[in-house]
């Protein structure tokens, strides 16, 4: 038993030209939240398969409104860790999927709009009980910075949380802060006991009694935001409170690169040069080959069979990234004009236009009903980006010029038979029902449950709907 923990540090526009200024569309304010999904890592699963190891959802972030004069976006993020409990053994190799969702808050035709802003997918090897692993991922025009770890809970110990540790009543031969584990009395395990008061969100420990800080936090208990705010794509007064990554003095202090990797400082961060056979931001991924199935979404893996050889994923159309984990986000180019909502249907792009606009990219400005005539008694309805006719019974089509079958919608309830009529439709009700659409049951004594039949009509008679 244990828990997988994910801490989002920052989400914002990636470096380079063409990055969006705001996560919100032109329609108004929005807020972000994150969804994390864990899947067993070595099985070749479809991208949309269930989150077999568990899933979690952040709280919705505070409302974000784009300020036209703002120099750069500073996105308020939801607070707290995302935690995914697991009951069985920690698998060690897993797929981590992080989705950033946007909820648009303005009043709109069709109700609130939700859209997936970014999705990153990583296949990782991670031992439970280890330190926080940091990662930076780009999805389209967005960049996500996060840390994650797996830790055992209750009495479970080990890299897979499969061994149970019972404290013994006899004096321990282990050092301070360590306890012996049954059944191996000679083996000592370090329970995750950090220095008292060490921040659960911003600190971690590899040895009992210590408190090491994540980037952006300082102090003996990692509770003080670092003062320098060089926030890599996110700037502003609230950067510290939203957990934005702020490099401490000396990013390579303590060598964050695992497995013998060498660390070199980059502007505001660090970069690991990994030895052969190791990959990842901190060289924490070892020996991934094509045998591990690292290519998502039907990508073709090419590489040698020996453990030290790298691999290359050749991605199918519509996907990109080193593991084909990123869907090509054609909506990030904002092709829909005039505040239209972009939908990437996979085979095509579709723009849903705001009222008063039309065209494949919402490029045509319409005066909805001006000069538009609806034939055969239809009325013009404004909205939806183009004029629309609400047609009289028996007519259909864009301008109500086509004869429509009023019985096509099967309007007669309870098995009633529908007949087209010059003025609409007629329902011939089954025994026991009455009403213009056969909607009213008739009681056995001949009295209907609702208004009596109009004069001249007996229950069960065909009734004409006028």
């Amino acid at each position: 038993a244990g828990v997988f923990e994910l801490q989002i540090h920052s989400f914002g526009p990636g470096p380079g030209p063409g990055a969006p200024r705001s996560p919100c569309s032109a329609r108004g304010p929005c807020r972000l939240f994150f969804r994390v999904c864990l899947k067993p890592g070595l099985s070749e699963e479809a991208a949309e398969s269930p989150c077999a190891l568990g899933a979690a959802l952040s709280a919705r972030g505070p409302v974000y409104t784009e300020q036209p004069e703002a120099p750069a976006p500073d996105l308020p993020l939801p607070n707290g860790l995302l935690q995914v409990p697991f009951r069985d053994a920690w698998p060690g190799t897993f797929s981590l999927i992080i989705e950033t969702w946007r909820e648009e808050l303005g009043d709109q035709i069709g109700g609130p709009a939700w859209s997936l802003l970014a999705r990153v997918t990583r296949r990782r090897r991670l031992a439970a009980g280890g330190p926080w692993a940091r990662d930076i991922q780009r999805a389209g025009a967005w960049e996500l910075r996060f840390s994650y770890r797996a830790r055992c809970e209750l009495l479970a110990v080990g890299t897979a949380c499969t061994r149970l540790c019972r404290p013994r009543s006899a004096p321990s031969r282990c050092g301070p802060g360590l306890r012996p584990c049954a059944p191996l009395e000679d083996e000592c395990e370090a329970p995750p006991v950090c220095r008292a008061g060490c921040s659960l969100e911003h600190g971690f420990c590899e040895q009992p009694g210590e408190c090491r800080c994540l980037e952006g936090w300082t102090g003996p208990l990692c509770t003080v935001p670092a003062s320098t705010s060089s926030c890599l794509g996110l700037r502003g007064p609230s950067s510290a409170t939203t957990g934005c990554l702020v490099p401490g003095p000396g990013p390579c202090d303590g060598n964050p690169c695992a497995n013998g990797g060498s660390c070199s400082e980059t502007p505001g961060s660090f970069e690991c040069t990994c030895p052969r056979g190791f990959y990842g931001l901190r060289c924490e991924v070892s020996g991934v080959t094509c045998a591990d199935g690292p290519c998502f979404n039907g990508g073709l893996c090419v590489g040698g069979a020996d453990p030290d050889s790298a691999y290359i994923c050749h991605c199918p159309p519509g996907f990109q990234g080193s593991n084909c984990e990123k869907r090509v986000d054609r909506c990030s180019l904002q092709p829909c004009r005039n505040g239209g909502l972009c939908l990437d249907l996979g085979h095509a792009l579709r723009c849903r236009c705001r009222a008063g606009f039309a065209g494949p990219r919402c490029e045509h400005n319409l005066d909805d009903c001006a000069g538009r005539a609806c034939a055969n008694g239809g009325t013009c309805v404004e909205g939806g980006g183009a004029h629309r006719c609400s047609c009289a019974l028996g007519f259909g089509g864009r301008d109500c010029r086509e004869r429509a079958d009023p019985c096509a919608a099967r309007p007669c309830a309870h098995g009633g038979r529908c007949y087209a009529h010059f003025s609409g439709l007629v329902c011939a009700c089954a025994p026991g029902y009455m009403g213009s659409r056969c909607e009213f049951p008739v009681h056995p004594d001949g009295v209907s449950a609702l208004p009596a039949a109009p004069p001249g009509l007996r229950p069960g008679d065909p009734q004409r709907y006028l």
């Epitope: 949309e48 035709i109 069709g110 997936l116 849903r352």
Partner: nanobody
Framework: QVRLVESGGGSVQAGGSLRLSCAAS????????MGWFRQAPGKEREGVAT????????AYADSVKGRFTISQDRAKNTVYLQMNGLKPEDTAMYYC??????????????????WGQGTQVTVSS
């Protein structure tokens, strides 16, 4: 593919209650959104209530707010619509719908790809 089967419709007096059920089968894990829509005779199909399946977030049409409640039982892959205080204008065919896409207007039937056959609700005054 996702298959949806509605049940629970019927006739009821104004002020009464009904509970509709929508049982989903197939690739249900890919459905991000599930909702209830209705179509009265001679009118367009309209959104009633939608649930974001993995986030427990909901959206309701103004005409049903405070009277209808959408919920789900994940273990049974079933979505419910509890309808209280029914009015004659609630009379319609009620459809369950699901969307697996990543951009949806929660009450717009045009954004939902999978539909059930519908269940009739009749409210008499």
């Amino acid at each position: 593919q996702v298959r949806l089967v509605e049940s629970g419709g019927g006739s009821v007096q104004a002020g009464g209650s009904l509970r509709l059920s929508c049982a989903a089968s197939g690739s249900t894990y890919s459905t991000n959104f599930m909702g209830w829509f209705r179509q009265a005779p001679g009118k367009e199909r309209e959104g009633v209530a939608t649930l974001v399946t993995w986030a427990e977030r909901t959206a309701y049409a103004d005409s049903v707010k405070g009277r209808f409640t959408i919920s789900q039982d994940r273990a049974k892959n079933t979505v419910y619509l509890q309808m209280n205080g029914l009015k004659p204008e609630d009379t319609a065919m009620y459809y369950c719908a699901a969307a697996a896409s990543t951009a949806v207007r929660l009450l717009d039937p045009g954004d939902f790809a999978y539909w059930g056959q519908g269940t009739q609700v009749t409210v008499s005054s």
